[in-house]
Each structure stands twice: as structure tokens, then as C-alpha cells.
């Protein structure tokens, strides 16, 4: 795809290796460019799938660095988008280099849920706090949301007790267990176990992509309080 300002196919080299990386729904485009005697500037455009009369929208114009944050130009994070990048040197422009198809929800990474555990009488209470992401500049949790298909559908919770591991599943749609801030799991304390270590990861709806796994949080129950 040639722009109107292109002055011949080989006058300005095309950017290469256009890639998109997304962490916590914050997608950034990266590309490579050969060293030039004159400083090149780049224009980055985004096209969203599923948007009526979808057109290429400018995300970054005439920038000199080799990356562009496109988070303000993403519609539904479940939908596909494409990116194209062109270079300009002086008055001459390159052809566009195009990215592969990318869906923020499918191809991006989401950070881990935060965990807290505590002992309440004869139970271990585990709080799993939804990861926070930025969507169109607003911080929000990736909890169950019927308005979108990009949410955490289930948490896999891994509990190690004195060496053996049990996996629990928490469905985020269950209002008894979850709200818009966190999910909660209660495990009975056994007199045979004094040490409990817990980690968790979220599983996204539709594609089954998993978030990063939380760090493992442990408690050791003092001997005197587990007897009887």
C-alpha cells in the first residue's frame, strides 16, 4: 500500500519487524529501521476489525522513536486490529509495513492477581484480587463483565499443604464467591497440616488465555493453634 507522498518504490526503506506487545491491555507497537544519514520519522496507523466503516486511524505521527502506544485507539480488546508503519525521510515516504493481526485479549499478557491469605478460626481465607488493567486510559478490574467477552472467567487456585498440591477453581460469575474487586475461597484447617502455600492465575473467557501466575503466599500455623 503506497501513500500519495511515495516517490518511487526504493527511495525510502520500509520499516521492518512490526510487532505488537500488550501488557495489561496496554498495547505498544515496535518496529526496526536501518540506520540512515538523515533522521527518519514514522507514522503509525491502526485499523480495528468490527468497527463500522473501519478506516486507518493515526496513532502516532512523525515520531522519531521506534515505538508507539496505541492503547487509546483500541476498541473492543477481543476484536482484531492491524497496524501499519511508514517512514519519512525529508520529503520522501516509504511504503507501509504491516503487522500481523493482533487481538489484545488473545495475544497480550495480563499481570497476576494479587493474593492475601489469613487464618480465621478453623479456616484459611484466601482473597484473590482481580488484576487491574488500563482500557482507554481508565483503570479497571478484569472481573466478570457481561458487556465484553474479555474478562477472567475462572481462577485456578493452587494450594500446597505440607508438600501435596490441590487445585481449586473459582468461577467469577458466582456472586457468592466474587465481586468486582475480588474472589474469596475458604479452606478448612486440618490438624495434620501446619503450612499452606497459595498461588493463583486467571483464565480469560473465549480464548482461555491465562494471566501471569501470582507469587506464592504462605502461612505457617503455630503448633499450639492447630491441636484439637
Amino acid at each position: 500500500e503506497m501513500g500519495t507522498a511515495d516517490l518511487g518504490p526504493s527511495s525510502v526503506p520500509t520499516p521492518t519487524n512490526v510487532t505488537i506487545e500488550s501488557y495489561n491491555m496496554n498495547p505498544i507497537v515496535y518496529w526496526e529501521y536501518q540506520i540512515m544519514p538523515q533522521v527518519p520519522v514514522f507514522t503509525v496507523e491502526v485499523k480495528n476489525y468490527g468497527v463500522k466503516n473501519s478506516e486507518w486511524i493515526d496513532a502516532c505521527i512523525n515520531i522519531s522513536h521506534h515505538y508507539c502506544n496505541i492503547s487509546d485507539h483500541v476498541g473492543d480488546p477481543s476484536n482484531s486490529l492491524w497496524v501499519r508503519v511508514k517512514a519519512r525521510v525529508g520529503q520522501k515516504e516509504s511504503a507501509y509495513a504491516k503487522s500481523e493481526e493482533f487481538a489484545v485479549c488473545r495475544d497480550g499478557k495480563i499481570g497476576p492477581p494479587k493474593l492475601d491469605i489469613r487464618k480465621e478460626e478453623k479456616q484459611i481465607m484466601i482473597d484473590i484480587f482481580h488484576p487491574s488493567v488500563f482500557v482507554n486510559g481508565d483503570e479497571q478490574e478484569v472481573d466478570y463483565d457481561p458487556e465484553t467477552t474479555c474478562y477472567i472467567r475462572v481462577y485456578n487456585v493452587y494450594v500446597r499443604m505440607n508438600g501435596s498440591e490441590i487445585q481449586y477453581k473459582i468461577l467469577t460469575q458466582k456472586e457468592d464467591d466474587c465481586d468486582e474487586i475480588q474472589c474469596q475461597l475458604a479452606i478448612p484447617v486440618s490438624s495434620l497440616n501446619s503450612q499452606y502455600c497459595v498461588s493463583a492465575e486467571g483464565v480469560l473467557h473465549v480464548w482461555g488465555v491465562t494471566t501471569e501466575k501470582s507469587k506464592e503466599v504462605c502461612i505457617t500455623i503455630f503448633n499450639s493453634s492447630i491441636k484439637g
Epitope: I117, R118, K119, C197, K215, E216, V217, C218, I219, T220, I221, F222, S224, S225
Partner: nanobody, 124 residues
Framework: EVQLVESGGGLVQAGGFLRLSCAAS????????MGWFRQIPGKERELVAA?????????YYADSVKGRFTISRDNAKNTVYLQMLSLKPEDTAVYYC????????????????WGKGTQVTVSS
């Protein structure tokens, strides 16, 4: 995050003693409870002793070391100690310290922030 360096381990005969030290970097040392753990190859780390964040505060000891081990801390030196007396061959392990939170009936910690540990070997 607090960096932890354990020292003071060594080879000692049964009935002997050692004093382990755990030096912490970071100005927030005094706000953390501290725990000493030990690990034998192939087994889970076990909590040996814990101390609450304030100097002279609460302490906890595993049944197997009660009366023989003493945990203490010096917040001015960012250091926690484990005095080990009347050592037994079953005390042989790598000893680690970690930061955590001390509650009335449990010690909570992240299973991440570990130093390299110090080897204690008790010969019979």
C-alpha cells in the same frame, strides 16, 4: 524489596552451639516480622522460629527446637539472629531467614524473598 544474607553456619559436634545472623538491606527492616526456616534436601522448608516486628516483641518456636533455640533482632543493625544451643544431628539443614507478618497464631510470608541460606551440619 528487602535483600537478605544469612551467615554463621558451619560444622559442629552434637551438643555444640552456633549463632546464625541474617543481615537485611533496606530501611523498612523494622516494619517486618522475621522468620528462620530450615530445609533438608527433598523436604519442604519448615518454620523454626519467628519474631514480630518490634524489638522485644512476640516470638514463636517449633516444638523440635523449643528451649534450645532463641530468635532475636537488632533493628538498629537490620539483623535478626538465631542462637542454637544443644545442637542435634537432626538440626542439620540449610537455614534461611525471610520477612513476613506475625499474627497471634500464624506467620505469613511470600515464598519468594529468600537469601542463599547458610548450611548447618551437626555431626554425631
Amino acid at each position: 524489596e528487602v535483600q537478605l544474607v544469612e551467615s554463621g553456619g558451619g560444622l559442629v559436634q552434637a551438643g555444640g552451639f552456633l549463632r546464625l545472623s541474617c543481615a537485611a538491606s533496606g530501611r523498612t527492616f523494622s516494619s517486618y516480622a522475621m522468620g528462620w526456616f530450615r530445609q533438608i534436601p527433598g523436604k519442604e522448608r519448615e518454620l523454626v522460629a519467628a519474631i514480630s516486628s518490634w524489638s522485644g516483641g512476640s516470638t514463636y518456636y517449633a516444638d523440635s527446637v523449643k528451649g534450645r533455640f532463641t530468635i532475636s533482632r537488632d533493628n538498629a543493625k537490620n539483623t535478626v539472629y538465631l542462637q542454637m544451643l544443644s545442637l542435634k544431628p537432626e538440626d542439620t539443614a540449610v537455614y534461611y531467614c525471610t520477612t513476613g507478618d506475625y499474627y497471634s497464631d500464624y506467620f505469613k510470608y511470600d515464598n519468594e524473598n529468600w537469601g542463599k541460606g547458610t548450611q548447618v551440619t551437626v555431626s554425631s
